[in-house]
């Protein structure tokens, strides 16, 4: 058993059918010695008397808010949550496996640049009685500070007969050095509590591996005289690291017909312009990627040929 926060305790339960459970001793936070009784949640049934209460925690029915009283007055509370292990594996019931980029991916994180700011998000089908707490650091043995905000509900969507909820959090490395080579990964830890169930989820990454630039901005077409060709131009996104001479992007320019089946023409360039043939009813799209490190491509910025 360990303390999650004041008066909230997590019991680690290795569960299997007929498991003996965990013996837990609760102590009433009071100088009083006599006439103390214990109850669980809203029940008036007295579970025991005395300054300490010993319970055998076998299942969620044994978790909840234990209260010690004296003469009708509440002395203190202890909320017991369960962290369940089955077949040697801690439960991961609260969050949905996003399966990208691999199985057992519960947390996904992205950064728009090298400033040390990043966003993580996760999915759940649970809509109520749910709280998250996020901590982060650079490295784990001698951790350097990363400050995370509160997790917030960022999207809701329907998937089949299921409603899915997306939560996200923004974090900022306290003393980020954008140009430095990373040697220690960022660690992100999410505590999730649903009703009386506690779970924790972790992710470890280098900022360079989670970079995903914003799409190029100010995408424009300039027709070339007496030609079906156009000059496409764009700019680096505002959110990208500066100076651009050091933090350089490479670009992919794509001409896509109205039909998805039509052949796509693609051009790769390090410049912020390109000359392409603009077909009728086609659209031109441009996306960006770090020039020197193969992290994610940005989403596409698009304009119609017409």
């Amino acid at each position: 058993i360990w303390e999650l926060k004041k008066d909230v305790y997590v019991v680690e339960l290795d569960w299997y059918p007929d498991a003996p459970g965990e013996m837990v001793v609760l102590t009433c936070d009071t100088p009083e010695e006599d006439g103390i009784t214990w109850t669980l949640d809203q029940s008036s049934e007295v579970l025991g008397s005395g300054k300490t209460l010993t319970i055998q925690v076998k299942e969620f029915g044994d978790a909840g808010q234990y209260t010690c009283h004296k003469g009708g007055e509440v002395l203190s509370h202890s909320l017991l949550l369960l962290h369940k292990k089955e077949d040697g594996i801690w439960s991961t019931d609260i969050l949905k496996d996003q399966k990208e980029p691999k199985n057992k991916t519960f947390l996904r994180c992205e950064a728009k640049n090298y400033s040390g700011r990043f966003t993580c998000w996760w999915l759940t089908t649970i809509s109520t009685d749910l709280t998250f707490s996020v901590k982060s650091s650079r490295g784990s043995s001698d951790p350097q500070g990363v400050t995370c905000g509160a997790a917030t509900l960022s999207a809701e969507r329907v998937r089949g007969d299921n409603k899915e909820y997306e939560y996200s959090v923004e974090c900022q490395e306290d003393s980020a050095c954008p140009a430095a080579e990373e040697s220690l990964p960022i660690e992100v830890m999410v505590d999730a509590v649903h009703k009386l169930k506690y779970e924790n989820y972790t992710s470890s990454f280098f900022i360079r591996d989670i970079i995903k630039p914003d799409p190029p901005k100010n995408l424009q077409l300039k027709p070339l005289k007496n030609s079906r060709q156009v000059e496409v131009s764009w700019e680096y996104p505002d959110t990208w690291s500066t100076p651009h001479s050091y933090f350089s992007l490479t670009f992919c320019v794509q001409v896509q017909g109205k039909s998805k089946r039509e052949k796509k023409d693609r051009v790769f360039t390090d410049k912020t312009s390109a000359t392409v043939i603009c077909r009728k009813n086609a659209s031109i799209s441009v996306r960006a990627q770090d020039r020197y490190y193969s992290s994610s491509w940005s989403e596409w910025a698009s304009v119609p040929c017409s």
């Epitope: 969620f60 019931d93 299921n162 009703k195 009386l196």
Partner: nanobody, 123 residues
Framework: EVQLVESGGGVVQAGESLRLSCAAS????????MGWFRQAPGTEREFVGA????????YYADSAKGRFTISRDNAKNTVFLQMSSLKPEDTAVYYC????????????????WGQGTQVTVSS
């Protein structure tokens, strides 16, 4: 929201078997841990057993161990209670319930309940 409808109850002789079904509709059935409870006249609702969302673990009250088996078919949104060697003291209304916490024998840990199906065991 999940709606639950029990079926399969009836009158049987002591020593016989009965299979109860609970059909779920509404939000995704496979998200929920499922439990069976029963209530005899004049008594509190009593836990019978539960099964986790994947159907890989079950949990039974002492009174059900060795005689009752819970299973589920997530493709058909149904949970089953197979009861054998029935005794007159098994006579009760049997309820199926859906919740988020497994294992739990506590009725308030279940959020959705069916209307129940009557099982009568005569001697």
């Amino acid at each position: 929201e999940v709606q639950l409808v029990e079926s399969g109850g009836g009158v049987v002789q002591a020593g016989e078997s009965l299979r109860l079904s609970c059909a779920a509709s509404g939000r995704s059935f496979s998200n929920y841990e499922m439990g069976w409870f029963r209530q005899a006249p004049g008594t509190e609702r009593e836990f019978v057993g539960a099964i986790n969302r994947r159907g890989s673990s079950t949990y039974y009250a002492d009174s059900a161990k060795g005689r009752f088996t819970i299973s589920r078919d997530n493709a058909k949104n149904t949970v089953f209670l197979q009861m054998s060697s029935l005794k007159p003291e098994d006579t009760a209304v049997y309820y199926c319930a859906a919740g988020w916490l497994f294992p739990s024998s506590r009725s308030r840990d279940y959020d959705y309940w069916g209307q129940g199906t009557q099982v009568t065991v005569s001697s």
